[in-house]
């Protein structure tokens, strides 16, 4: 087969670069090395072109640089002679999104590269369980996200749509609360928040365990296991055990996988097993009293997941106590 060396060219060379809010990024541009190099990085919006960074006659020229880029851009000056015209861009803001054009001129070549910069943010979301009077709610919350995420709920692995969404931040980043009323339900719930730009997904899973009926002075074992489907082996996570009382949560124990440190806030609380395999975070609560009745919440959280397990404990008076009265 004869392959012709005849080409039709697309105008410019275009690349999409994705950065994160507040972080640094490199906008790439390369050229065949040459002498007397001229480099101009420009930002183009619908109305205007702004000078981002210029280099010619052997040095950076920032006299005409737009103020929004002051102290935030630089070139790799010692690599220019090797054909590197990439721009180092500090502290990205959402306003930096858009089209950047890098023009490079040498004695033998002219090159125009186009870079489309997109900026995203995805602060780790949270799943919260709240009781308001006699109602129970699950809240999926992301404090700072851009662009708008896709939020989906499932009940017993079946997608559902009835949720109440609240959003603040008109242009972004957005703060989003998605609330689901789960009063009287024994189902398991899952909330997924997806940032399609950053290709990041977070999942919150809530499970209500069967009620536990115990006698005073007995002990109770509260199960909480890390599901391998959710957590990868090297992922840092934290485990928090807390008790819900009149809508207020008080922490009983706290564990950090990175340091493998546990802090107990209740002396009667202890791990069921040694945390050798770091997957079973079941707890023992000893010497139960009537006031220990209530809801116990295990929260296992990483950057990508939150697993909430709820136990309802009913402590009843023992026979002796009952006959004494």
């Amino acid at each position: 087969i004869f392959l012709s060396a005849f080409f039709t060219y697309v105008p410019m060379n275009e690349q999409i670069i994705i950065g994160r809010l507040g972080e640094d990024i490199i906008l790439p541009s390369s050229f065949e090395r040459g002498s007397e190099v001229v480099i101009h990085w420009k930002y183009q919006d619908s109305y205007n072109s702004y000078n981002v960074h210029s280099y010619y006659k052997g040095s950076g020229r920032l006299e005409s640089q737009d103020t929004r880029y002051a102290n935030r851009t630089s070139l790799f000056y010692n690599e220019i002679q090797n054909g590197n015209a990439s721009l180092f861009f500090r502290r990205l803001s959402l306003l930096d999104e858009g089209i950047y054009t890098c023009y490079v001129g040498t004695a033998i070549q002219a090159i125009t590269n186009k870079v489309v910069l997109k900026v995203g943010v995805f602060l780790t979301p949270m799943m919260k369980y709240e009781k308001r009077n006699t109602n129970s709610f699950l809240i999926c919350n992301v404090l700072s996200v851009y662009p708008r995420p896709i939020i989906t709920w499932k009940m017993d692995n079946t997608p559902i749509s009835e949720n109440n969404m609240q959003e603040t931040g008109s242009l972004g980043p957005f703060s989003i609360n998605s609330t689901l009323n789960i009063t009287g339900s024994n189902s398991s719930y899952e909330c997924t928040i997806e940032n399609s730009l950053l290709k990041q997904t977070w999942t919150g899973r809530w499970t209500m365990k069967d009620g536990l009926h115990k006698m005073q002075s007995e002990h109770v074992s509260l199960s909480c296991e890390l599901v391998n489907d959710y957590f990868s082996p090297n992922q840092d996570f934290k485990v928090t055990w807390s008790r819900m009382e009149s809508g207020i949560s008080s922490i009983l124990a706290y564990y950090l996988s990175s340091s493998q440190n546990t802090t107990f806030y209740e002396s009667r609380f202890s791990w069921n097993k040694e945390l050798k395999n770091q997957s079973d975070f079941s707890m023992n609560l000893t010497d139960l009293s009537l006031s220990d009745s209530g809801e116990y919440l295990c929260n296992i959280s990483s950057d990508e997941y939150t697993l909430l397990t709820i136990h309802t404990v009913h402590v009843e008076p023992s026979q002796e106590t009952a006959s004494d009265n």
Partner: antibody, heavy 116, light 107 residues
Amino acid sequence: QVQLQQSAAELARPGASVKMSCKASGYTFTTYTMHWVKQRPGQGLEWIGYINPSRGYSDYSQKFQGKSTLTTDKSSNTAYIQLTSLTSEDSAVYFCARGGYDFDYWGQGTTLTVSS
Amino acid sequence: DIVMTQSHKFMSTSVGDRVSITCKASQDVGTAVAWYQQKPGQSPKLLLYWASTRHTGVPDRFTGSGSGTDYTLTISSVQAEDLALYHCQQHFITPYTFGGGTKLEIK
């Protein structure tokens, strides 16, 4: 020595398209950018755009975007300009010129006459 | 786009005279200016680039100067063969732009 040999004069009807060539010799074709410049009778020079044979892309002056298409054939060391939807405004001499930011060698020019 | 303005369309001079052709850019072009000579019926020829660097084979009677927005091509002692159209061009950034040209006539 460096030479840029351009195709013969063209006579075209309004609305038609034309393709002119520029054959390079005496240097490595892919090393240099090829520019195209327009000159109307008794007027100054207008930069149309460039094509980068080694990289495989081009850049155009806004005015000529859509009007002109630049291509190359590396096997024959030839650059081409195609002009579409011709009008009398396109009647001019078209030069190819080798260079980076300045144009050190020029073709002899191709005269395009658009007339009904 | 950067606009290059050559205020004199024509300049008249005598052989042996010193002549200066000017060119003004609409913004600072950082000495990235080239000058071309175009004789009747011919294609342009590069004389200078980076405002003052002579291209190979260009006689030293041609000199260039300037910075910022104002640039000058000077012919120290005009010869009869210098009768031509002179173009300035900014090679600072694309789209490259040319001045309207200055025609040098011999009296």
